[in-house]
């Protein structure tokens, strides 16, 4: 028994004095608690208490479930304990099935003996099956075994509490360990489309998926900037232990212009947090946005191809495109196609493809796209680079030489004079009039140049050349003179093409 | 033997909040779960959600999810159930039960009658 | 989450009778399943847990057997106390499911 120095409260004192007591089923419990400040006896025994205010505790017929731990307190809070074990063949163990373990924590199967001095007190596994090898345990009779370190792998193993009772095995009821997964990740979230664009009045609705080991994770949706609470719909599945799904569903029944914004799906456990956001759109109607991919002035040589390609933001989806030319609308040579398959794209590419350009191919090439809001078009300028070509080269009543030539860009008339039969015409003749003169043809067609010289001037046998040149190339035609006399003759004039 | 005692009964108007009460009696509280389930007139049995054992986070069915709060004070052995934004269908009996986590309720509590009208 | 479905929804029987209730799930449970027995008016008590198992203080006329996910509870000789609601419920994960209950009424 306890002893103190006098003066300070002591622990009551307990009859019989001895830390544990054995007594058979059916013999009489008596402990007496000693102390002038008694309070109250409790008795403990796995998930139970009782208390008792009489000094002595008195059981007439003892039973096995009377094993269990005795205190007596007294009005200074201290107290003395005997622990008392009622043998009984028939029930070895007291039992509490309830066993949960904590992963990597103890936990104990709680099947406290009724008898000390039975042997080889241990866990079995159920049905003759051994325990994981890695498995390790402590026994206490007075509380039970305690499972150190709890795995994962021991979720739902099924135990049996054991003893040798006189060389024979006896085992306690069932228990099946359900473990309690430690949070050793971050949970997963994801999000099912990362932006969402929609007009005011349609739905929005999106879905955070959670995946964690345990139903225990907490996730939210959460607006940005706002600590409003948000209306989710869940859904969730075990796919097998420690692997579990949630879908929470946010949904906006009629979106508003105000409610565009930033919304985070956020999702923690013990061991931390994640998040995912998708950003929500609103417009009051729909778009169509043209960014074209080359200059809207194209300038493209004779007989080259060039692609007029234009890219396009569209909401709702577009319903019609077409390519125009002169009133009338490809049918073919084109294609339009989004720009990624992205389920959230809105941006969409649209090409024309002109092939072996002619001179009279040139002019406004219009693109048009609709969907059920909206219209929108954008026009190219398609100039076509060609060579000039001489259209006439005469000797006028008046005496003038003159040149017509078309060409694109704007073809530039020079006159040179070679006289006799020198082959290079090298003196240049400076013109006495130069016209640009109106197409007949289409717009960005080619432009025609007048420019004459006046024959008078030349007093001698020799050649007349009138060249024809811009970015693209060069053309010239000829004109011989012979004199008789005082007579001047135009021989046949030719021309002849420079690369 | 363990007890649960829960708390009074309850009328509530539509819109707010119900907190209800379970203390556990006649034994230690930490190492069980503790779940509560309710019982509409003349329905059936509903889970809602388990608390412990160990601390960490409750888990809760997905149809109350987001809007029932289960809380535990394990000095006073007392566990909590706060349902929020009452409608009349919540009108029903809750009870506290030990067990629920992957186990059955061996110990109910009495149950309270939360009523819900305007 | 797992559906449980309990069948018949109720039932007259008459004392001395031997009466059996099934309960199925919609994927299998393995014996994680326990029957519990209320009363108007009460809380419903364990009667069977683990499938098979009979709950300490349950009377032995009262028994339980199935694994997977048909189970049956059986009285084998129903006594007037026992003119109750039956419920069966699933615990093999964390979200816990109840059938809709069996009335055994007297005939």
């Known amino acids: 028994q306890p002893s103190v120095s006098p003066g300070e409260p002591s622990p009551p004192s307990i009859h019989p004095g001895k830390s544990d007591l054995i007594v058979r089923v059916g013999d009489e419990i008596r402990l007496l608690c000693t102390d002038p400040g008694f309070v109250k006896w409790t008795f403990e025994i796995l998930d139970e208490t009782n208390e008792n205010k009489q000094n002595e505790w008195i059981t007439e017929k003892a039973e096995a479930t009377n094993t269990g731990k005795y205190t007596c307190t007294n009005k200074h809070g201290l107290s003395n304990s005997i622990y008392v074990f009622v043998r009984d063949p028939a029930k070895l163990f007291l039992v509490d099935r309830s066993l949960y373990g904590k992963e990597d924590n103890d936990t104990l199967v709680r099947c406290p003996l009724t008898d000390p001095e039975v042997t080889n007190y241990s866990l079995k596994g159920c049905q003759g099956k051994p325990l994981p090898k890695d498995l390790r345990f402590i026994p206490d009779p007075k509380a039970g075994i305690m499972i150190k370190s709890v795995k994962r792998a021991y979720h739902r193993l099924c135990l049996h509490c054991s003893v040798d009772q006189e060389g024979k095995s006896v085992l306690s009821e069932k228990f099946i360990l359900k473990v309690r997964p430690a949070f050793k990740a971050v949970p997963v979230v994801s999000v099912s489309k990362a932006s969402y664009l929609l007009r005011e009045g349609e739905e929005f609705t999106v879905t955070c998926t959670i995946k964690d080991v345990s139903s225990s994770v907490y996730s939210t949706w959460k607006r940005e900037n706002s600590q409003t609470k948000l209306q989710e719909k869940y859904n969730s599945w075990h796919h097998g232990d420690f692997n579990y799904e949630r879908q929470a569903t946010l949904t906006i029944s009629s979106a508003r212009v105000n409610d565009s914004g930033v919304f985070m799906c956020y999702a923690n456990n013990t061991f931390g947090s994640a998040n995912v956001t998708t950003t929500l759109e609103v417009v009051d109607k729909g778009f169509i946005n043209i960014f074209p991919m080359i200059n809207t002035t194209v300038f493209v040589n004779d007989g080259e191809n060039v692609d007029l390609i234009v890219e396009y933001e569209a909401f709702p989806k577009p319903e019609h495109q077409q390519w125009i030319y002169m009133n009338r609308t490809f049918t073919d040579k084109w294609e339009d196609y989004p720009k990624s398959e992205n389920e959230s794209n809105i941006r969409y590419v649209s090409e024309l493809h002109l092939t072996r350009l002619k001179g009279t191919e040139g002019g406004t090439y219009t693109f048009l796209v609709s969907n059920s809001d909206v219209n929108a078009a954008i026009a190219f300028n398609v100039y076509v680079n060609t060579k000039p070509e001489i259209l006439t080269y005469d000797r006028l009543v008046n005496g003038m030489l003159q040149c017509v030539a078309a060409g694109f860009p704007e073809p530039t008339i020079d006159w040179y004079f070679c006289p006799g039969t020198e082959q290079r015409c090298s003196a240049s003749v400076l013109p006495v009039d130069v016209q640009t003169l109106n197409s007949s043809g289409p717009p960005f067609g080619k432009l025609v140049v007048q420019s004459s010289i006046d024959s008078s001037a030349f007093k001698h046998n020799g050649t007349v050349e009138c060249k024809a040149y811009n970015d693209v190339g060069k053309t010239s035609a000829y004109f011989n003179f012979a004199f008789k006399g005082n007579n001047k003759e135009q021989i046949h004039p030719h021309t002849l093409f420079t690369p | 033997q363990v007890q649960l005692v829960q708390s009074g009964a309850e009328v509530k108007k539509p819109g707010s909040s119900v907190k209800v009460s379970c203390k556990a009696s006649g034994g230690t509280f930490s190492s069980y779960a503790i779940s509560w389930v309710r019982q509409a007139p003349g329905q059936g049995l509903e889970w809602m959600g388990t608390?412990?054992?160990?601390?960490?986070?409750?888990r809760y069915a997905q149809k109350f999810q987001g809007r029932v709060t289960i809380t535990a004070d394990e000095s006073t052995s007392t566990a909590y159930m706060e349902l929020s934004s009452l409608r009349s269908e919540d009108t029903a009996v809750y009870y506290c039960?030990?067990?629920?986590?992957?186990?059955?309720?061996?110990?109910w509590g009495q149950g309270t009658l939360v009523t819900v009208s305007s | 989450d797992i559906q449980m479905t309990q069948s018949p929804s109720s039932l007259s029987a008459s004392v001395g009778d031997r009466v059996t209730i099934t309960c199925r799930a919609s994927q299998s449970i393995s014996n994680y399943l326990a029957w519990y027995q209320q009363k108007p008016g009460k809380a419903p008590k364990l009667l069977i847990y683990?499938?098979?198992s009979l709950q300490s203080g349950v009377p032995s006329r009262f028994s339980g057997s199935g694994s997977g996910t048909d189970f049956t509870l059986t009285i084998s000789s129903l006594q007037p106390e026992d003119f109750a609601t039956y419920y069966c419920q699933q615990y093999y994960y964390e979200s816990i499911t109840f059938g809709q209950g069996t009335k055994v009424e007297i005939k």
């Open positions: 683990d499938a098979s």
């Open positions: 039960a030990r067990g629920g986590y992957i186990s059955d309720f061996d110990v």
């Open positions: 608390i412990g054992p160990f601390e960490g986070q409750p």
